[in-house]
Amino acid sequence: MMTGTIETTGNISAEKGGSIILQCHLSSTTAQVTQVNWEQQDQLLAICNADLGWHISPSFKDRVAPGPGLGLTLQSLTVNDTGEYFCIYHTYPDGTYTGRIFLEVLESSVAEHGARFQIP
């Protein structure tokens, strides 16, 4: 019964010291989104709750900004930020939908950005 699909920014790269927007979009489902969790590996970065709004994990408060939309902005990037990021949509009655984004933070001054994807 899970008919939805998640589109993400896919594999992206960014320069050290710069910022990047992580974006996911859930489509093709009538399910209602009650919460979106953003995680890096097994670490919770942020929660966007339909009722309560945004909560950024204390350890990331300085470098993570909510939005745009349900997305997440990572700032002051370091090489250690390289890795997998997950958007986890909690939906009724479908359950959870998970999107994956791989971010590579480059030392080089020339970082190729993946195709930027806009939420309509």
């Epitope: 019964m1 009650t34 339909a50 009722d51 909690h90 009655p93």
Partner: antibody, heavy 122, light 106 residues
């Protein structure tokens, strides 16, 4: 106080229509899905379906398509159930119920309306 | 659709008794199960969600356990106000309810 208040009992003739209202208060109406549940006299609970309070999109359970319509008026935080071409077997208490919980692990019908008795009799 | 089978359908017990109600799902539903109490002429009241989490304000004599296909609701010491009908509900997919268990005074 978080609550759902439903409209009063209805006595209808077969073939008529009825519209039951469910007014929410004390919370953000559009953040929580709304369900409708039927309970025939002396029987158990039967899930009729739900409406996405963010988009207004309704989903109907098997056996509740055609004559049953879920709708919303978000400006007054109210959900509606309309039943057309009423039959004797539609006689039941109809409940609206909110899905509480933010993550899927916590979903449950945490707030219920008091119920609306719909009697269909000639 | 996922079917829920509650047993027993009727249960006679006395105040102070330990009461256990079982709910079996036709397929695995992880821990996506809730329990409700309903008294005559009243709306159901949520007791337990996520199979074992007690809803705020519900007395601690109520507890839930299980995962997968078999779940139990236990009332450790039955009180006069606990005589009612109890329903399980799965939320793993489109919700369905069990047939109910009526707890009567012996």
């Amino acid at each position: 106080e978080v609550q759902l208040v439903q409209s009063g009992s209805e006595l209808k003739k077969p073939g008529a229509s009825v519209k039951v209202s469910c007014k929410a208060s004390g919370y953000t109406f559009t953040a929580y899905p709304m369900n409708w549940v039927r309970q025939a006299p002396g029987q158990g609970l039967e899930w009729m379906g739900w409406i996405n309070t963010n988009t207004g999109n309704p989903t109907y359970a098997q056996g509740f398509t055609g004559r049953f319509v879920f709708s919303l008026d978000t400006s007054v935080s109210t959900a509606y159930l309309q039943i057309s071409s009423l039959k004797a077997e539609d006689t039941a208490v109809y409940y609206c119920a909110r899905v509480g919980g933010y993550s899927v692990y916590d979903y449950a019908f945490d707030i219920w309306g008091q119920g609306t008795m719909v009697t269909v009799s000639s | 659709d996922i079917q829920l089978t509650q047993s027993p359908s009727f249960l006679s017990a006395s105040v102070g008794d330990r009461v256990t109600i079982t709910c079996r799902a036709s397929q695995g539903i992880s821990s996506y199960l809730a329990w409700y109490q309903q008294k005559p002429g009243k709306a159901p009241k949520l007791l337990i969600y996520a199979a074992s989490t007690l809803q705020s304000g519900v007395p601690s004599r109520f507890s839930g356990s299980g995962s997968g296909t078999e779940f139990t609701l236990t009332i450790s010491s039955l009180q006069p106000e606990d005589f009612a009908t109890y329903y399980c509900q799965q939320l793993n997919s489109y919700p369905t309810f069990g047939g109910g268990t009526k707890v009567e005074i012996k």
